[in-house]
Interface confidence: low
């Protein structure tokens, strides 16, 4: 109990800083949460003059801002790093920027990859 209907167990994983942090670069991440806490996926990225630079993707624990979001949508107007979170397995595969103040919706889809499972 305490989890959303779209229960999150696995998320797309990515770490742009994988060499320095000694992790895998990409794959799948199994989410582990505390009892009665909700689990989410997230994505963070930068947008340099229209060029999308993916920063990280993975599991995100019990954040109110992620509740009942089936899609990963960043709503900040013009942050240094875009951040979105969502509920549901692999919901962070695609991510979108849709400013709350209005403006064009921009959806980013990843290139097809053969992900490896992180343990």
């Amino acid at each position: 109990s305490g989890r959303g209907e779209a229960e999150t167990r696995e998320c797309i994983y990515y770490n742009a800083n994988w060499e320095l942090e000694r992790t895998n670069q990409s794959g799948l991440e199994r989410c582990e949460g505390e009892q009665d806490k909700r689990l989410h996926c997230y994505a963070s990225w930068r947008n340099s003059s229209g060029t999308i630079e993916l920063v990280k993707k993975g599991c995100w624990l019990d954040d109110f801002n992620c509740y009942d979001r089936q899609e990963c949508v960043a709503t900040e107007e013009n942050p240094q790093v875009y951040f979105c979170c969502c509920e549901g397995n692999f919901c962070n595969e695609r991510f979108t920027h849709l400013p709350e103040a209005g403006g064009p919706e921009v959806t980013y889809e990843p290139p097809p990859t053969a992900p490896t499972l992180l343990t």
């Epitope: 997230y42 963070s44 019990d62 954040d63 109110f64 951040f83």
Partner: antibody, heavy 114, light 106 residues
């Protein structure tokens, strides 16, 4: 789950200061860390929050440019840093876990006086 | 977003039912938490998501509301409930606390 903050500090105006918030009992990068100020005899003020995953921070306009939030993932610790303290920075500072501040540190008292 | 708590102070007796109100200057859905702080102590979250009771918090505490108006209710006040209560909205930046409600013994 625990957030343990560094000890009380007494500083002079113009000096720099960095206080810490060491977390344990959970995955540090899975929760935002928020900072809250409480001036003597006053209410709670939300200063900002930092995403430990990529160190992205949101600041309240009241604190933007005067304090810097940072993290060190290798030791699961968040920091609040002042380059130049003012007497008006005298307050209790709390770190807390998550967007809705579910778990709090014990607080760090900062006294700035000449 | 401005959060206005009322009353700013009140006195009540053990066993009383007490209601504290928090109004948001614009809609915040249910992105609201309630905190209790005793003198010299760390704030403690009582309610999150406007109406969800924090684990370990006595059931005499309850929260309700959505949008712009929220209430914290304490049924049958206990001696340990005399403290200052704050609401927090975490829907829009900058997140903001109410100014606090000091609950004193009558």
């Amino acid at each position: 789950v625990q957030l343990v903050q560094s000890g009380a500090e007494v500083k002079k105006p113009g000096e720099s200061l960095k206080i810490s918030c060491k977390t344990s009992g959970y995955t540090f990068t899975h929760y935002w860390i928020g900072w809250v100020r409480q001036m003597p005899g006053k209410g709670l003020e939300w200063m900002g929050r930092i995403n430990p995953t990529d160190s992205y921070a949101d600041y309240s306009p009241s604190f933007q440019g005067h304090v810097i939030m940072s993290v060190d993932k290798s030791v699961s610790t968040a920091y609040l840093h002042w380059n130049s303290l003012k007497a008006s920075d005298t307050a209790m500072y709390y770190c807390a876990r998550g967007t809705a501040l579910g778990v709090w540190g014990q607080g760090t008292t900062v006294t700035v006086s000449s | 977003i401005q959060m206005t708590q009322s009353p700013s102070a009140m006195s009540a007796s053990v066993g009383d039912r007490v209601t504290i109100t928090c109004r948001a200057s614009q809609g915040i859905s249910n992105y609201l938490a309630w905190f209790q702080q005793k003198p010299g102590k760390v704030p403690k979250r009582l309610i999150y998501a406007a109406s969800s009771l924090q684990s370990g918090v006595p059931s005499r505490f309850s929260g309700s509301g959505s949008g712009t108006e929220f209430t914290l209710t304490i049924t049958s006040l206990q001696p340990e409930d005399f403290a200052t209560y704050y609401c927090l909205q975490h829907k829009s930046y900058p997140y903001t606390f109410g100014q606090g409600t000091k609950l004193e013994i009558k």
